[in-house]
């Protein structure tokens, strides 16, 4: 079996963590978040070739069926395996508050 | 906000559970699974337009950034939100065994 972390398409082409610099305006948050004004958003981007970072047996099945029926079954998709929490300072009725979000920033990625 | 379960692309076009009929040969399991010979594989297929079955805030972010930078950030992807278990009868060194797999069949779907 191919090494599950070796990308056969070339370096950086397969499913991995990327950082995208975004403003509150980019994120659509400007009306309810005060700070930070800019966020380093980590997200999962890249192709999911056979055996690459397969999350589970469902991903294996999906890849096998995709090879057989590419028009019906899509290839597995690069998604977060876990998340990093993030703090946002929000506007509230009474002023401002620090709020934790657990599902904003991808921590690592796999193919499902 | 659009109803998170109303598909704006038309019935059946958005992320949802599909059933694909597959043989052990299709799945690449013929050398280690005895039964069942054919499986109704449930998997998540379909588009993830804005606000449709968004799994979490990360999916919202991803969609907002996809609209801004479609060449850099892909749209959210339709993946299992949970799984149904499945029993396989496997070949073993000593004969056969019943084995439960918890991550084979998608139970429901969302966009991440």
């Amino acid at each position: 079996a191919r090494n599950g972390d070796r990308c056969p398409l070339g370096p950086g082409r397969c499913c991995r963590l990327h950082t995208v610099h975004a403003s509150l305006e980019d994120l659509g948050w400007a009306d309810w978040v005060l700070s930070p004004r800019e966020v380093q958003v980590t997200m999962c981007i890249g192709a999911c070739p056979s055996q690459f970072r397969e999350a589970n047996m469902h991903a294996q099945i999906k890849m096998n069926l995709h090879r057989l029926k590419p028009d019906t079954v899509p290839a597995p998709c690069c998604v977060p395996a876990s998340y990093n929490p993030m703090v946002l300072i929000q506007k509230t009725d009474t002023g401002v508050s620090l709020q934790t979000y657990d599902d904003l920033l991808a921590k690592d990625c796999h193919c499902v | 906000a659009r109803n998170g379960d109303r598909c704006p692309l038309g019935p059946g076009r958005c992320c949802r559970l599909h059933t694909v009929h597959a043989s052990l040969e299709d799945l690449g399991w013929a050398d280690w699974v005895l039964s069942p010979r054919e499986v109704q594989v449930t998997m998540c297929i379909g588009a993830c337009p804005s606000q449709f079955r968004e799994a979490n805030m990360h999916a919202q972010i991803k969609m907002n950034l996809h609209r801004l930078k479609p060449d850099t950030v892909p749209a959210p992807c339709c993946v299992p939100a949970s799984y149904n278990p499945m029993v396989l009868i496997q070949k073993t060194d000593t004969g056969v065994s019943l084995q439960t797999y918890d991550d084979l069949l998608a139970k429901d779907c969302h966009c991440v």
Partner: antibody, heavy 119, light 107 residues
Amino acid sequence: QVQLVQSGAEVKKPGASVKVSCKASGYTFTSYGINWVRQAPGQGLEWMGWIDAYSGSTNYAQKLQGRVTMTTDTSTSTAYMELRSLRSDDTAVYYCARGPGQYADVDVWGQGTMVTVSS
Amino acid sequence: DIQMTQSPSSVSASVGDRVTITCRASQGISSWLAWYQQKPGKAPKLLIYAASSLQSGVPSRFSGSGSGTDFTLTISSLQPEDFATYYCQQANSFPITFGGGTKVEIK
């Protein structure tokens, strides 16, 4: 590099006011908030409050409410902290510090401004 | 307000020693704890943020762990420049609060 440079030491009489400045450089001032933290001689760190450099929204420590005002001037990338009705127990080093960022980090601090309240 | 309790308040140690400082929050603060080092007459310096992330430029002998209410700062092998006072700080909610400090002194 990212820097916060504060105004010089002050000596004030009880009942007076003091205004400390904190000039930011090396980053986009409006992208972060500014905290003010003080430290009495030989004591620990006490958070005074926070101001969003972009909107001017504030959150003050309860015990200082009514006596403290934090402001920003985005044209000069400067934050200000004014403390009124000074008492001897306000004698402290006053620090400005950038943050919290997305990982709750208060990462860059000014060098501190010594404020002495004495009759 | 969330109270932060640091212990010990002081510790005497020698160069090369492993030093552990603990910080307890009066309620859960997720992983939103930072550790600072302060030397006399200087501003605090951020060492660790988000409980265990090492700030850029900080030597790897410093490490942080914990989540919820109990946190630890460890200096794996104390160096002469590490003699200072260390503070923990929570930024889970306003008001931001600091621990009382731990002075690391030369034995």
